[in-house]
């Protein structure tokens, strides 16, 4: 038995930040689980982890230097990524593992979400134009 995962096909990070919601065909309430977000077609980079254990406090961390936070819903985990760089535009995959109660469960690989990171605009604002050329 595999858990199914739904993700948005594409998200745009306008201010170098994005919320990516992973929706599962499984209720995480009162479960011990590990939800993670992976970058790249081969999922080679684990971006962020949300670890939940029954009623205990959620733990959120990144082993790879990403600035991330996470929020838990009954059948979803939302990853909030900040300080993304333009060159981190890529496809991101949600993964879920349930360790308790047995048996161990994980998910069918999802279709992923392309996160397109738009650089911060450095153009001068019309209200404060740059110095005029002679």
């Amino acid at each position: 038995n595999k858990i199914l995962v739904k993700q948005s096909p594409m998200l745009v990070a306008y201010d170098n930040a994005v919320n990516l919601s992973c929706k599962y065909s499984y209720n995480l309430f009162s479960r011990e689980f590990r939800a993670s977000l992976h970058k790249g077609l081969d999922s080679a980079v684990e971006v962020c982890v949300v670890y939940g254990n029954y009623s205990q406090q959620l733990q959120v961390y990144s082993k790879t230097g990403f600035n991330c936070d996470g929020k838990l819903g009954n059948e979803s985990v939302t990853f909030y990524l900040q300080n993304l760089y333009v060159n981190q535009t890529d496809i991101y995959f949600c993964k879920i593992e349930v360790m308790y109660p047995p048996p161990y469960l994980d998910n069918e690989k999802s279709n992923g979400t392309i996160i397109h990171v738009k650089g911060k605009h450095l153009c001068p604002s019309p209200l404060f134009p740059g110095p005029s050329k002679p």
Partner: antibody, heavy 115, light 107 residues
Framework: QVQLQQWGAGLLKPSETLSLTCAVY????????WNWIRQPPGKGLQWIGE???????NYNPSLKSRVTISVDTSKNQFSLKLSSLTAADTAVYYC?????????WGQGTLVTVSS | EIVMTQSPATLSVSPGERATLSCRAS??????LAWYQQKPGQAPRLLIY???ARATGIPARFSGSGSGTEFTLTISSLQSEDFAVYYC?????????FGGGTKVEIK
Amino acid sequence: QVQLQQWGAGLLKPSETLSLTCAVYGGSFSGYYWNWIRQPPGKGLQWIGEINHSGTTNYNPSLKSRVTISVDTSKNQFSLKLSSLTAADTAVYYCARGEAVALYWGQGTLVTVSS
Amino acid sequence: EIVMTQSPATLSVSPGERATLSCRASQSVNSNLAWYQQKPGQAPRLLIYGASARATGIPARFSGSGSGTEFTLTISSLQSEDFAVYYCQQYYNWPLTFGGGTKVEIK
């Protein structure tokens, strides 16, 4: 109740390779990260590295060139190898469960490196 | 790597008194900090994670606080079984790193 039981040689010579194994009893083996942590006599704790059931590893950069952690899911066991030993590697070596915080620990194995 | 510094190295306290242990990180670790207790000849035992959440079965006299770079473990009224060495550990960045420990001894 989760229990970790570890074993391996306790007395080694410089340049030899340390080899320890940790068996996990109770609970799931899959889904968790399994760690090795060491503690030189009278000193603090140093994280060595971790592995999960599918063989994904993370190592402490200060030891990475000498460390190999492997897993045998059929036996619910994971192992540590540390090569090119020196006296500075003398420590109590612990196995533990948990990739961020270690909730369950093995009993510890004192490894002495001496000529 | 993130360097964790604990102070004081040794704390002498009478039973029933309050003990306050400090841990400082070389850079922000948000709230990704744990505290462990270790008694001679034993493995460490997890007390606190997430800077302030008590692990299962840990008595209410243990409390953690702080975020960013400054953290505190408070034992409100020391019992005889609390005399031990206490370590902080960050899990904001890998590699995981521990403080040098604070020994709480009987005054």
